[in-house]
């Protein structure tokens, strides 16, 4: 059995899935800001777990997903006060009783050292410095991201 | 109805210790971040610390860290703030608000506690 | 450390008389800026939050305006009530900091 907050990541992914496909993101739009092949919006308000997936979704966007250790550092050097939390895409899955990325895939526990409880209704939020688990009722600021698409140059053959 | 009772006020002498208890109820605890404001007699207000709704990040004041822990049981829907190595100068009345995260503002107070530094 | 410097520290005003309140910030703040009010023995009540949203339950004749470091609470016609002192705060960054306070006295 899913919890809420699971049917809602997969239904947002699923509506995602069924969109037509896009022209490749070659820049940010006008108030993102670029993170390497990403572009990241920190949101202003705040907002519950679920509320935010939905907000990113509305943008054409995700929450936020770290790949690895490197990615989180460089994030969390744009976050400008070690009072503010900001919630990513990553929740804890009651049914496989582990963290769980919006994307479906598991955490990999090398990745992030989080501070507090993997249970139900467990989400992740980052701030400057740390990784944490918080109630996903609690709301916090969210991080969207939209992928960059890599300029690959062109090789022509010889003439 | 959302309600903040604090307790643990008194008279405690310089280099002493006391804990404050800040109960709430009438709202999902666990979901807010929470703080300590003080007010030292016919003064302004001074934010003294803060704390994470599941408990695991903390934040202080410069003029209590070192000195002051901020906790909570969410169990017990219950704040805390230890206060060790008293000085005169943290005579005042301690309220506990909801809110903490930034931007949050306070939205509720309690009705504060006393505390008197003095020999 | 994000200093807040209110104008004037008291005033004297009659009911009906219409108050303006300014808060100052040392550097910008953005709308990051909240007023409470609170009268003798009790505890400072949240007024408005984020410059200028009403908090919930707070008459309409309180409002307020501003951005980036000058902020403004408007007591539209003055209130036996609203005889307090009235705090500005800024949520910014941290330390959290308030300003001196206003003691709105009746003329």
């Known amino acids: 059995q899913k919890s809420s907050i699971e049917k809602c990541s997969v239904d947002i992914q699923q509506s995602r899935n069924k969109t037509t496909e896009r022209p490749g993101l070659l820049n940010c739009p006008i108030y993102w800001q670029q993170l390497r092949e990403k572009c990241l919006l920190f949101s202003h308000t705040v907002n519950p777990w679920n509320n935010s997936l939905a907000d990113c979704s509305t943008k054409e966007s995700s929450l936020l997903l770290i790949r690895d250790k490197d990615e989180l550092i460089h994030t969390q050097n744009l976050i400008r006060d070690k009072a503010i939390l900001f919630w990513i895409g990553l929740n804890f899955s009651l049914s496989e009783k582990n963290w769980k990325w919006i994307n479906g895939s598991f955490l990999n526990s090398n990745d992030l050292e989080i501070r507090g409880d993997a249970k139900e209704n467990s989400c992740i939020s980052i701030s400057q410095t740390s990784v944490y688990s918080e109630y996903c009722s609690t709301e916090i600021r969210w991080i969207c991201q939209k992928e960059l698409t890599p300029v690959r140059n062109k090789v022509y053959p010889d003439s | 109805e959302v309600q903040l009772v604090e307790s643990g006020g008194g008279l405690v002498q310089p280099g002493g210790s006391l804990r404050l208890s800040c109960a709430a109820s009438g709202f999902t605890f666990s979901s807010y971040a929470m703080s300590w404001v003080r007010q030292a007699p016919g003064k302004g207000l001074e934010w003294v610390s803060a704390?994470?709704?599941?408990?695991?990040?903390?934040y202080y004041a410069d003029s209590v860290k070192g000195r002051f822990t901020i906790s909570r049981d969410n169990s017990k829907n219950t704040l805390y703030l230890q206060m060790n190595s008293l000085r005169a100068e943290d005579t005042a009345v301690y309220y506990c608000?909801?809110?903490?995260?930034?931007?949050?503002?306070?939205?509720?107070w309690g009705q504060g506690t006393l505390v008197t530094v003095s020999s | 450390d994000i200093q807040m410097t209110q104008s004037p520290s008291s005033l004297s005003a009659s009911v009906g008389d219409r108050v303006t309140i300014t808060c100052r910030a040392s550097q910008s703040i953005s709308s990051y800026l909240n007023w409470y009010q609170q009268k003798p023995g009790k505890a400072p009540k949240l007024l408005i939050y984020a410059a200028s949203s009403l908090q919930s339950g707070v008459p309409s004749r309180f409002s307020g305006s501003g951005s980036g470091t000058d902020f403004t609470l408007t007591i539209s016609s003055l209130q036996p009530e609203d005889f307090a002192t009235y705090y500005c705060q800024q949520t910014y960054s941290t330390p959290l900091t308030f300003g001196q306070g206003t003691k709105v006295e009746i003329k």
């Open positions: 704390i994470s709704g599941s408990g695991g990040s903390t």
């Open positions: 608000a909801r809110g903490g995260y930034l931007p949050d503002a306070f939205d509720y």
